[in-house]
């Protein structure tokens, strides 16, 4: 007496299932139900997505279309993708930044804010990993600058300059007094 | 036991408006279609509205426009709201369940009726 | 709308017959493999019971005696031995589509 029987739809293919009354058919992506079917194994009536929505899978009951998502301009967003019917906008960075998760258990879904990308030349050193998905990776000095505490310092123009162990090792010089 | 009471029937002038109700028991309303159904004296069935259990509600021409099927799943109760009222609406009207073994209109229990009469 | 058209309209029998009613739709009510007729039993002053589903199911609680046939446009309702708590009038309905329709009705008295 519980009504916990779901009679199984019959139909032809296998994307049926009752809405309302009878077994209709879904939806396909990129389209809302705008009235369930009104005979057995029917087609419903199904709506395209107006502009700015989308839905990306076939689906039976949604009444209407998800809102595309806006990327967020504060944190430098772009659209990689722009929202269509059956997908919403795809969010991310423009070139030369990168994506900075804004939760510990980054997933791609994930709140997100662009960060500039370290330009490893303007610190005198190597690129060892382009950035896209993380930070630039930046290797050792440039010909010419040697380590230095953090950073990368030019070899002395003359031989009046100081040039400690580590300077002469890779600029070739001598400390002279 | 499954129970359908209708009440809410009555004498009202053409034009006129009247809600009827019919209050559920012995099963999960909320699981099961419903309809309303009415037979004019000594005449034939005629199917009047149906609300679906995910929240459809169907009319055949004759009534749309006038007449609003409703449900109060917590309250396990079907309604029909009718406006505009002529003297061909003058009937009994049933509530019916439909039933649940089925993905196709069918009704499984009724109620006794409810009496409606249109005249001025 | 389809429309159902029972014959006869009353007929007159005595306890123990074979009573066989027909109902005819204005088009066929059989898609994807099923016969969407159904049949009740309405006795004066009372509700309609459900007899039949899909044209030859029984519904529970309902006498073997009953049984119902057809497909396409043209069904019937057999009753193999008429007891004396069977006279009343039968109803055929489809849910071929919307709207649902009953046929006009088939009053079986007693003779």
């Known amino acids: 007496q519980g009504g916990t029987r779901s009679p199984r739809c019959d139909c032809a293919g296998d994307f049926h299932k009752k809405i309302g009354l009878f077994c209709c058919r879904g939806c396909p992506a990129g389209h809302y139900l705008k009235a369930p079917c009104t005979e057995p194994c029917g087609n419903s009536t199904c709506l395209v997505c107006p502009q700015d929505t989308f839905l990306a899978w076939e689906n039976h009951h949604n009444s209407e279309c998800a809102r595309c998502q806006a990327c967020d301009e504060q944190a430098s967003q772009v659209a990689l993708e722009n929202c269509s019917a059956v997908a919403d906008t795809r969010c991310g960075c423009k070139p030369g930044w990168f994506v900075e998760c804004q939760v510990s258990q980054c997933v791609s879904s994930s709140p997100f804010y662009c960060q500039p990308c370290l330009d490893c030349g303007a610190l005198h050193r190597h690129t060892r990993l382009l950035c896209s998905r993380r930070d630039t990776d930046c290797g050792t000095c440039l010909p010419g600058f040697y380590e230095h505490g953090d950073g990368c310092v030019s070899c002395p123009t003359s031989t009046l300059g100081s040039c400690p162990e580590r300077c002469a090792a890779v600029c070739g010089w001598r400390q002279m007094f | 036991e499954v129970q359908l009471v209708e009440s809410g029937g009555g004498l009202v002038q053409p034009g006129g408006s009247l809600r009827l109700s019919c209050a559920a028991s012995?099963?999960?309303?909320?699981?099961?279609?419903m309809s309303w159904v009415r037979q004019a004296t000594g005449k034939g069935l005629e199917w009047v509205a149906a609300f679906s259990s995910d929240g459809y509600t169907f009319y055949p021409g004759s009534v749309k426009g006038r007449f609003t099927i409703s449900r109060e799943n917590a309250k396990n109760s079907l309604y029909l709201q009718m406006n505009s009222l002529r003297a061909g609406d003058t009937a009994v009207y049933y509530c019916?369940?439909?039933?649940?073994?089925?993905?196709?209109?069918?009704?499984?229990?009724w109620g006794q009726g409810t009496l409606v009469t249109v005249s001025s | 709308d389809i429309q159902m058209t029972q014959s006869p309209s009353s007929l007159s029998a005595s306890v123990g017959d074979r009573v066989t009613i027909t109902c005819r739709a204005s088009k066929s009510v059989s898609t994807s493999g099923y016969s969407y007729m159904h049949w009740y039993q309405q006795k004066p002053g009372k509700a309609p019971k459900l007899l039949i589903y899909?044209?030859?199911n029984l519904e529970s609680g309902v006498p073997s005696r009953f049984s119902g046939s057809g497909s396409g446009t043209d069904f019937t309702l057999t009753i193999s031995s008429l007891q004396p708590e069977d006279f009343a009038t039968y109803y055929c309905?489809?849910?071929?589509?919307?709207?649902?329709?009953f046929g006009g009705g088939t009053k079986v008295e007693i003779k």
């Open positions: 899909l044209a030859s």
């Open positions: 019916a369940r439909h039933a649940d073994y089925a993905n196709y209109p069918v009704m499984d229990y």
């Open positions: 309905q489809h849910s071929r589509e919307l709207p649902l329709t």
């Open positions: 012995g099963f999960t309303f909320s699981n099961y279609d």
